[in-house]
Amino acid sequence: MAVTACQGLGFVVSLIGIAGIIAATCMDQWSTQDLYNNPVTAVFNYQGLWRSCVRESSGFTECRGYFTLLGLPAMLQAVRALMIVGIVLGAIGLLVSIFALKCIRIGSMEDSAKANMTLTSGIMFIVSGLCAIAGVSVFANMLVTNFWMSTANMYTGMGGMVQTVQTRYTFGAALFVGWVAGGLTLIGGVMMCIACRGLAPEETNYKAVSYHASGHSVAYKPGGFKASTGFGSNTKNKKIYDGGARTEDEVQSYPSKHDYV
């Protein structure tokens, strides 16, 4: 029963994690304009892996895709690759783990086959989670580096009179979604691997031994104690991630309703 619960829980946690990785990959808010210690602008910039967006204080939002492949920074390409690999591995892992679930009967599938599939999906979830965490962390590192570089020369004098203010970017919501989702996928994968150990049948087959007790004749046959109850057949797997949409007030820079600018 515990094995089934562990496997089922591992599957659900991984499912939520992979949904989160997909959401993070699609979100536009990987980096958002830093508003601290900056002149207050009526325009808010944010960027994702696939496009950059500008929202004016009027509410008008315009997004532009990165229509070049060769012109993009290598680090951004690497992050894209890591996230896609994470999603693909996670999706395959989910597919494999569905057939590996102990509560699902498929023909006369051996327990050893289910154990192998559980282990495979567990490893896939672990690698998927690591890919997502790595991707998000690489992007975060890139942001930190750029942030301090642009802080160092934030005001670039032009002829002494005119100043251009560089837009600095800080961590966007997608990074936190990605870290949490990657962590959940990783935890789910570990749970699947733990469940695999419980699923694997014992290698040593003991001969059945009869023990005669006074008054009762009970034969104890060790080796094949299986839980007959299915786990969570009516469990609802709810996707609880946010696809990246934000209202003006949620993302907007202004901390209070009354601002002096």
Epitope: Q33, V40, V43, E56, S58, E248, Y254, K257, H258
Partner: antibody, heavy 119, light 113 residues
Framework: QVQLVQSGAEVKKPGSSVKVSCKAS????????IEWLRQRPGQGLEWMGE????????KYNVKFKDRVTITADESTSTAYMELSSLRSEDTAVYYC????????????WGQGTLVTVSS | DIVMTQSPSSLTVSLGEKATISCKSS????????????LTWYQQKPGQPPKRLIY???TRESGVPDRFSGSGSGTDFTLTISSLQAEDLAVYYC?????????FGQGTKVEIK
């Protein structure tokens, strides 16, 4: 069609306050900013502040800090601008305007309200 | 605050001639995210409220005659009236709508020779 109708001209004494109204019609008000600006005689335009109808979010020009209060009554589609501690240099035409959906600038304007501060 | 400097303060042009008004900002109004400059041009006729002519430095407001055009990026902007008409007699203002508080130029009065 979009219309912003402002209240009539006012004559005020120094130290008193004035409250100018701006009634909007002809569009869905929620989600639009209403701006308040002023123009002193023979001078340029000065931005005072703005209110986002539907959310109550307000921004003020720090120059008018503590003297200007911008409010709105959603039920009557009316925005208000109150300027206190009036001085003779506050004599101006006060405008309300709507911030357009593109460009952060003001696409429709009220007809203006002349406020004269005189002892 | 951003300082907007317009030149000249007044301009006298013959009907049918070209009128050019310049506007400079103390900081760049160019947003790197969309490569748009947040500068607006307004026309104010005597006794009337201002009317938006051009936003994003070069986008003409619908209904504005095509003799009005805006150009420039960053800190230097120009409003051009290609062929001045009698009804163009007005004061023209440029506005920074990138940084709060929004600021205006002192205005350029266009008169007919």
């Amino acid at each position: 069609q979009v219309q912003l109708v402002q209240s009539g001209a006012e004559v005020k004494k120094p130290g008193s306050s004035v409250k100018v109204s701006c009634k909007a019609s002809g569009y869905t008000l929620t989600g639009y900013w209403i701006e308040w600006l002023r123009q002193r005689p023979g001078q340029g335009l000065e931005w005072m502040g703005e209110i986002l109808l539907g959310s109550g979010s307000i921004k003020y020009n720090v120059k008018f800090k503590d003297r200007v209060t911008i409010t709105a009554d959603e039920s009557t589609s009316t925005a208000y601008m109150e300027l206190s501690s009036l001085r003779s240099e506050d004599t101006a035409v006060y405008y309300c305007a709507r911030k357009g959906l593109r460009g952060n600038s003001f696409d429709y304007w009220g007809q203006g309200t002349l406020v004269t501060v005189s002892s | 605050d951003i300082v907007m400097t317009q030149s000249p303060s007044s301009l006298t042009v013959s009907l049918g001639e070209k009128a050019t008004i310049s506007c400079k900002s103390s900081q760049s109004l160019l947003n790197a995210g969309n490569q748009k400059s947040y500068l607006t041009w307004y026309q104010q006729k005597p006794g009337q409220p201002p009317k938006r002519l051009i936003y994003w430095a070069s986008t003409r407001e619908s209904g504005v005659p095509d003799r009005f055009s805006g150009s420039g990026s960053g800190t230097d902007f120009t409003l051009t009236i290609s062929s001045l008409q009698a009804e163009d007699l007005a004061v023209y203002y440029c506005q920074n709508d990138y940084y709060y508080p929004f600021t205006f130029g002192q205005g350029t009065k266009v008169e007919i020779k």
